[in-house]
């Protein structure tokens, strides 16, 4: 059935970058300027995305593929295909409805984007805090207090070597 349909449908022969023009007896016409078709057999071409304002063009639109946008300096992409440009903040802050706000105590952000996340809880791994956390940096965990008691060695045996990217068997 598919083969029969494709034989009967002249539009199926129209390649990407063209559209099947009903106004011209279903011949394949090139996509007009500022439009594209990324697959064959299309009856219309899609309008190219325009990267305006805080969006800037990462890849120009062609007859077969849409434009791709990223963000101007001071902004970063959010969402699939960079659907949103969000303002950067400083390290140690997160962007809220009220603007860039410092991370509250116990949280940090080491980037200009994203959210304030809680410091690592060293005690969950039986370790102690070696270096305190700040708004910009996570805590650094060290050996457990027991490991540091007199007479105890602070050197732990090395873990068995494992190739990166491989799961343990």
């Amino acid at each position: 059935f598919e083969r029969t349909r494709s034989l009967q449908d002249p539009c199926s022969n129209c390649p990407a970058g063209t559209f099947c023009d009903n106004n011209r007896n279903q011949i394949c016409s090139p996509c007009p300027p500022n439009s594209f078709s990324s697959a064959g057999g299309q009856r219309t071409c899609d309008i190219c995305r325009q990267c305006k304002g805080v969006f800037r063009t990462r890849k120009e639109c062609s007859s077969t593929s849409n434009a791709e946008c990223d963000c101007t300096p001071g902004f970063h992409c959010l969402g699939a295909g960079c659907s949103m440009c969000e303002q950067d903040c400083k390290q140690g802050q997160e962007l809220t409805k009220k603007g860039c706000k410092d991370c509250c105590f116990g949280t940090f952000n080491d980037q200009k984007r994203g959210i304030c996340r809680p410091w690592t809880n060293c005690s969950l791994d039986g370790k102690s805090v070696l270096v305190n956390g700040t708004k910009e940096r996570d805590v650094v965990c060290g050996p457990s207090p027991a490991d540091l008691s007199p007479g105890a060695s602070s050197v732990t045996p090395p873990a068995p070597a494992r190739e990166p990217g491989h799961s343990p068997q």
Partner: antibody, heavy 123, light 109 residues
Framework: EVQLLESGGGLVQPGGSLRLSCAAS????????IHWVRQAPGKGLEWVSD????????NYADSVKGRFTISRDNSKNTLYLQMNSLRAEDTAVYYC????????????????WGQGTLVTVSS | EIVLTQSPGTLSLSPGERATLSCRAS???????LAWYQQKPGQAPRLLIY???SRATGIPDRFSGSGSGTDFTLTISRLEPEDFAVYYC??????????FGQGTKVEIK
């Protein structure tokens, strides 16, 4: 599958209190702002409050400021709305909804919504 | 706060017709900060459009959004029976509380 399930609604007298909960599943709860939005019977939508992924930033509508408190427990994947000094005009279906973008503390639109829980304030 | 005014209040149309819904803001809103929702009786709202013109996941291409500044439009190119519902616009612009329009009901003529 993303799911949000509200609970805790019911009938309460004016001046009373109620705590709503929203249990989330199917996504990384701690990566998203979460909103409360309400809808009075036969009326439109009204945004109530939202909270940033780890609770450092909260926002409230003027109509509930000082009476409602939003909070979250990321270890339980649960959002809360503590409602005090309730008034007749707080009667509504309360929805929790997930922020449009992850890893942002900014209040955007909402892409997933729960089915809502009805709060009735009446004597 | 930014007030959103939707018009018309009710739109009476037949299946197959084109629906044009308007949302006007009391002050300028960047197009990145405007969304449209659909709500059917007894159901939660459903996100249709965000960033004024981006379709949400799973939304048919008969729904399109446009506009900038203070004037925004939701267009349903060809109404299907399941499209008869109430539609809300919403803004989430900087420093202003999130607000919704009062809604436009699209009903069967």
């Amino acid at each position: 599958e993303v799911q949000l399930l509200e609970s805790g609604g019911g009938l309460v007298q004016p001046g009373g209190s109620l705590r709503l909960s929203c249990a989330a599943s199917g996504f990384t709860f701690s990566a998203y702002n979460i909103h409360w939005v309400r809808q009075a019977p036969g009326k439109g939508l009204e945004w109530v409050s939202d909270i940033s992924p780890y609770g450092g930033a909260t926002n409230y509508a003027d109509s509930v400021k000082g009476r409602f408190t939003i909070s979250r427990d990321n270890s339980k994947n649960t959002l809360y709305l503590q409602m005090n000094s309730l008034r007749a005009e707080d009667t509504a279906v309360y929805y929790c909804a997930r922020n449009l973008y992850e890893l942002s503390a900014y209040s955007y639109g909402a892409d997933y919504w729960g089915q809502g829980t009805l709060v009735t304030v009446s004597s | 706060e930014i007030v959103l005014t939707q018009s018309p209040g009710t739109l009476s149309l037949s299946p197959g017709e084109r629906a044009t819904l308007s949302c006007r803001a009391s002050q300028s809103v960047s197009s990145s900060y405007l969304a449209w929702y659909q709500q059917k009786p007894g159901q939660a709202p459903r996100l249709l459009i965000y960033g004024a013109s981006s379709r949400a996941t799973g939304i048919p291409d008969r729904f399109s959004g446009s506009g900038s500044g203070t004037d925004f439009t939701l267009t349903i190119s060809r109404l299907e029976p399941e499209d008869f519902a109430v539609y809300y616009c919403q803004q989430y612009y900087y420093s202003s509380p999130i607000t919704f329009g009062q809604g436009t009901k699209v009903e069967i003529k």
